[in-house]
C-alpha cells in the first residue's frame, strides 16, 4: 500500500513516460517537404509530455527506445487522384543533429489515400524528428485523419 | 531484490496496466454502423484487463493516455470489390458520454481490403469507444484479420 | 528520491521491458515463405533486449502480453505490379512450439506495395514468431521500409 502511494507521488518524468501526439498545423513553403505539427490541450486531443516542438518539428528530451507512429491522409483524395499523382511518399526521420540524420520510416501512397505505420527506434535527447511529404497532394488537417506521435518505451 | 519482489506482489491494476484486445462478434442491425466486439480467453487470444464490454462496445475504466489500435479486413474482398463499393470507411470514436463524443481515428478503404492504424489519445473512465463501419461490405470475422485494442500508456 | 534511485538501479529485465526491432536479412529458400530477420546495433537501428533470434526467427523469452508490429514493403513495386502479382500476403504467427501454432496477423497487398499493422497478443517464453510472405514478389531490405518488432506490455 505504501509502495503504491510512493509510486503515485513520484513525478512521472522520473519514470520516463515521455509521450506526444501531434496534429497537423501546416505544410512547409515551396521547397520544404516537411509537415509542421502542433500539440496541446487547447487544440483538442493532442499533447506533449516531455518532448517539445521546435518550429513545428518534434524534439526528443529523453534518451530511450520510442514507439513512433504516424497516419497521414491526403486531402480530397480518391484512388484515382492518388495514382494520378504518384509518387506521393511520406518519410519520418531524424533531421537534426545532422550527424544523426537518418530515415526511420517510409511509405508510398500508390492507389491509397492514407498511410499509417509505427516502429520502435532508439532516440536520443536532442534528436529532432521530421516528417517529409513529397508529391503534389495536400495532407488532410482533420485531426482523426492525420496525426503523429511518439511514446517512450524503455531506456 | 526485496523491491523487485514487492513490485511483483503489487496488483497490476495499481500500476495502471489496463489493456484489451478484442475480436469481431457481429455487425449491427440495419441502421447501426457499429461493429460489436467480444473478448476473453475462451474465445482465443482476445482479452480484457481493466476495460469492459458494454453491449459489444469497449468501455474505459481508468483515466489516462491510451494507445488505440485497429485492423479491419473486408470479407471476400478484392481491390475491384473495394473500389466498386467505395466509399467504405472505418471510424473509431468516443460515442458516450455524449458530451465527450468525438472521432479519434478515420480511414477509407479505397482500393484496399484492409485498414490498420493506431494513435495515442487521452481517455477517461466511462468513455465508451465505438467503431463505425459505413458502406455495404462485411468485415471479416477472422481473428487475425479484424481486431481492436487499447493499451494504457500513462496517466 | 531514494525510491527513484532504487528503481534506476534495478536491472531492466526485472521490470519486464523486453523489446526487439528487427530488419530484414533475407528471404527463405524456394519452398520456405518465411522472412529471415536480423538485429543488433552493428546493423543500424535494430536491437534485441530480451527476445532472441533463432535462425532468423524471433523467440520470446518472457511470458506476457506483447505489442507486435510489422511493416513490409515490396521491392521495385508499383500498384500495377502489386495487382498483377496478387495475391501477395503477409502473415505473422507463432510457428513453434507446434502445439501453440496460430496466425496472429494477416494482410494482403492488393494494389498496394506496403502493409503495416500491429496488435496486442499474449506470448509465452519459448514462442517463436514467423513472418510468412506468400507470392512471387521480393520484400524491400531498406531498413525504413521493412521491419518487425515486439514490445512487452504487461504480464
Amino acid at each position: 500500500q505504501r509502495f503504491a502511494q510512493a509510486q503515485q507521488q513520484l513525478p512521472l518524468e522520473s519514470l520516463g513516460w515521455d509521450v506526444a501526439e501531434l496534429q497537423l498545423n501546416h505544410t512547409g513553403p515551396q521547397q520544404d517537404p516537411r509537415l509542421y505539427w502542433q500539440g496541446g490541450p487547447a487544440l483538442g486531443r493532442s499533447f506533449l509530455h516531455g518532448p517539445e516542438l521546435d518550429k513545428g518539428q518534434l524534439r526528443i528530451h529523453r534518451d530511450g527506445i520510442y514507439m513512433v507512429h504516424i497516419q497521414v491522409t491526403l486531402a480530397i483524395c480518391s484512388s484515382t487522384t492518388a495514382s494520378r499523382h504518384h509518387p506521393t511518399t511520406l518519410a519520418v526521420g531524424i533531421c537534426s543533429p545532422a550527424s544523426r540524420s537518418i530515415s526511420l520510416l517510409r511509405l508510398s501512397f500508390h492507389q491509397g489515400c492514407t498511410i499509417a505505420s509505427q516502429r520502435l527506434t532508439p532516440l536520443a535527447r536532442g534528436d529532432t524528428l521530421c516528417t517529409n511529404l513529397t508529391g503534389t497532394l495536400l495532407p488532410s488537417r482533420n485531426t482523426d485523419e492525420t496525426f503523429f506521435g511518439v511514446q517512450w518505451v524503455r531506456p | 531484490q526485496r523491491f523487485a519482489q514487492a513490485q511483483q506482489q503489487l496488483p497490476l491494476e495499481s500500476l495502471g496496466w489496463d489493456v484489451a484486445e478484442l475480436q469481431l462478434n457481429h455487425t449491427g442491425p440495419q441502421q447501426d454502423p457499429r461493429l460489436y466486439w467480444q473478448g476473453g480467453p475462451a474465445l482465443g487470444r482476445s482479452f480484457l484487463h481493466g476495460p469492459e464490454l458494454d453491449k459489444g462496445q469497449l468501455r474505459i475504466h481508468r483515466d489516462g493516455i491510451y494507445m488505440v489500435h485497429i485492423q479491419v479486413t473486408l470479407a471476400i474482398c478484392s481491390s475491384t470489390t473495394a473500389s466498386r463499393h467505395h466509399p467504405t470507411t472505418l471510424a473509431v470514436g468516443i460515442c458516450s458520454p455524449a458530451s465527450r463524443s468525438i472521432s479519434l481515428l478515420r480511414l477509407s478503404f479505397h482500393q484496399g481490403c484492409t485498414i490498420a492504424s493506431q494513435r495515442l489519445t487521452p481517455l477517461a473512465r466511462g468513455d465508451t469507444l465505438c467503431t463505425n463501419l459505413t458502406g455495404t461490405l462485411l468485415p471479416s470475422r477472422n481473428t487475425d484479420e479484424t481486431f481492436f485494442g487499447v493499451q494504457w500508456v500513462r496517466p | 528520491q531514494r525510491f527513484a534511485q532504487a528503481q534506476q538501479q534495478l536491472p531492466l529485465e526485472s521490470l519486464g521491458w523486453d523489446v526487439a526491432e528487427l530488419q530484414l536479412n533475407h528471404t527463405g529458400p524456394q519452398q520456405d515463405p518465411r522472412l529471415y530477420w536480423q538485429g543488433g546495433p552493428a546493423l543500424g537501428r535494430s536491437f534485441l533486449h530480451g527476445p532472441e533470434l533463432d535462425k532468423g526467427q524471433l523467440r520470446i523469452h518472457r511470458d506476457g502480453i506483447y505489442m507486435v508490429h510489422i511493416q513490409v514493403t515490396l521491392a521495385i513495386c508499383s500498384s500495377t505490379t502489386a495487382s498483377r502479382h496478387h495475391p501477395t500476403t503477409l502473415a505473422v504467427g507463432i510457428c513453434s512450439p507446434a502445439s501453440r501454432s496460430i496466425s496472429l496477423l494477416r494482410l494482403s497487398f492488393h494494389q498496394g506495395c506496403t502493409i503495416a499493422s500491429q496488435r496486442l497478443t499474449p506470448l509465452a517464453r519459448g514462442d517463436t514468431l514467423c513472418t510468412n510472405l506468400t507470392g512471387t514478389l521480393l520484400p524491400s531490405r531498406n531498413t525504413d521500409e521493412t521491419f518487425f518488432g515486439v514490445q512487452w506490455v504487461r504480464p
Partner: antibody, heavy 119, light 111 residues
C-alpha cells in the same frame, strides 16, 4: 418500403432478344447492386448477372456473350437485355437485391417476368 | 462453379414434427469467418423468400422455428415445429464466389 417492379414481355420468338426493366423504389442504385436470376423447370434457379453501384457488371460466364445489363440511376431503373433467345431460355426472370450488404443473397425480389420462347 | 446438392428431394412431415433439409457444397463456401450459405422458401406463383442468411442468421420477420447450421461444405436447415404454412419448396444458395449457385430444391409436404 423497398420495392422492385418488373416490366417486360411475355412471348418471345426464337433468336430474338429479351428486354426487361426493373424499377426500384425506397433505395438508391448508387448504393446497391441489382442482380438478375431466372427460374425454369429444367435448370431451376440460375444466377445471370449483376450491375453494381458503380455501373460495372459481372455475368454468368455461360451466358456472358448474350447478356447486357445497364441502368439509369436518376430514373431508378435497371435494364436487362438478353440476345439470341432459344426455347431453353423459357423461364421466370427476376431482379433481386440485398438489404444491407452488397453480397449475393436476396431479401428483396421483383415479382418476376414470365418469358416463354416459342415459334 | 460450386455445385450445391440438396437432400432429400422431397419429404413429408407431420404437423409439429421436425423437418431437416441438407445442403452439401462441392467445395467450401466458408471465408472471412463466415459461411456464405443461405436458405429460401418458395411457394407456387411467388418469388423465393429469404429465410436464413450466412448459415444461421434469421432474416427479419421469419419465425424462430426456422434455424440453420453448418460450416465448410455441409449445411442443414431445420424447421421445428412444422406448421401448415411451411409446405413449400426450400432452396439453399451460396455467395462465396461468382457465380452464386442454388440447390435443386427440397419439396416439403405435410402428412
Amino acid at each position: 418500403q423497398v420495392q422492385l417492379k418488373q416490366s417486360g414481355p411475355g412471348p418471345v420468338q426464337p433468336s430474338q432478344s429479351l428486354s426487361i426493366t426493373c424499377t426500384v423504389s425506397d433505395f438508391s442504385l448508387t448504393i446497391f447492386g441489382i442482380h438478375w436470376v431466372r427460374q425454369s423447370p429444367g435448370k431451376g434457379l440460375e444466377w445471370l448477372g449483376v450491375i453494381w453501384r458503380d455501373g460495372s457488371t459481372d455475368y454468368n460466364v455461360a451466358l456472358m456473350s448474350r447478356l447486357n445489363i445497364t441502368k439509369d440511376n436518376s430514373k431508378s431503373q435497371v435494364f436487362f437485355k438478353m440476345n439470341s433467345l432459344q426455347t431453353d431460355d423459357t423461364a421466370i426472370y427476376y431482379c433481386a437485391k440485398n438489404r444491407r450488404y452488397d453480397y449475393a443473397w436476396f431479401p428483396y425480389w421483383g415479382q418476376g417476368t414470365l418469358v416463354s420462347v416459342s415459334a | 462453379d460450386i455445385v450445391l446438392t440438396q437432400s432429400p428431394a422431397s419429404l413429408a412431415v407431420s404437423l409439429g414434427q421436425r423437418a431437416t433439409i441438407s445442403c452439401r457444397a462441392s467445395k467450401s463456401v466458408s471465408a472471412s469467418g463466415y459461411s456464405f450459405l443461405h436458405w429460401y422458401q418458395q411457394k407456387p406463383g411467388q418469388p423465393p423468400k429469404l429465410l436464413i442468411y450466412l448459415t444461421s442468421n434469421l432474416e427479419s420477420g421469419v419465425p424462430a422455428r426456422f434455424s440453420g447450421s453448418g460450416s465448410g461444405t455441409d449445411f442443414t436447415l431445420n424447421i421445428h415445429p412444422v406448421e401448415e404454412e411451411d409446405a413449400a419448396t426450400y432452396y439453399c444458395q451460396h455467395s462465396r464466389d461468382f457465380p452464386p449457385t442454388f440447390g435443386a430444391g427440397t419439396k416439403l409436404e405435410l402428412k
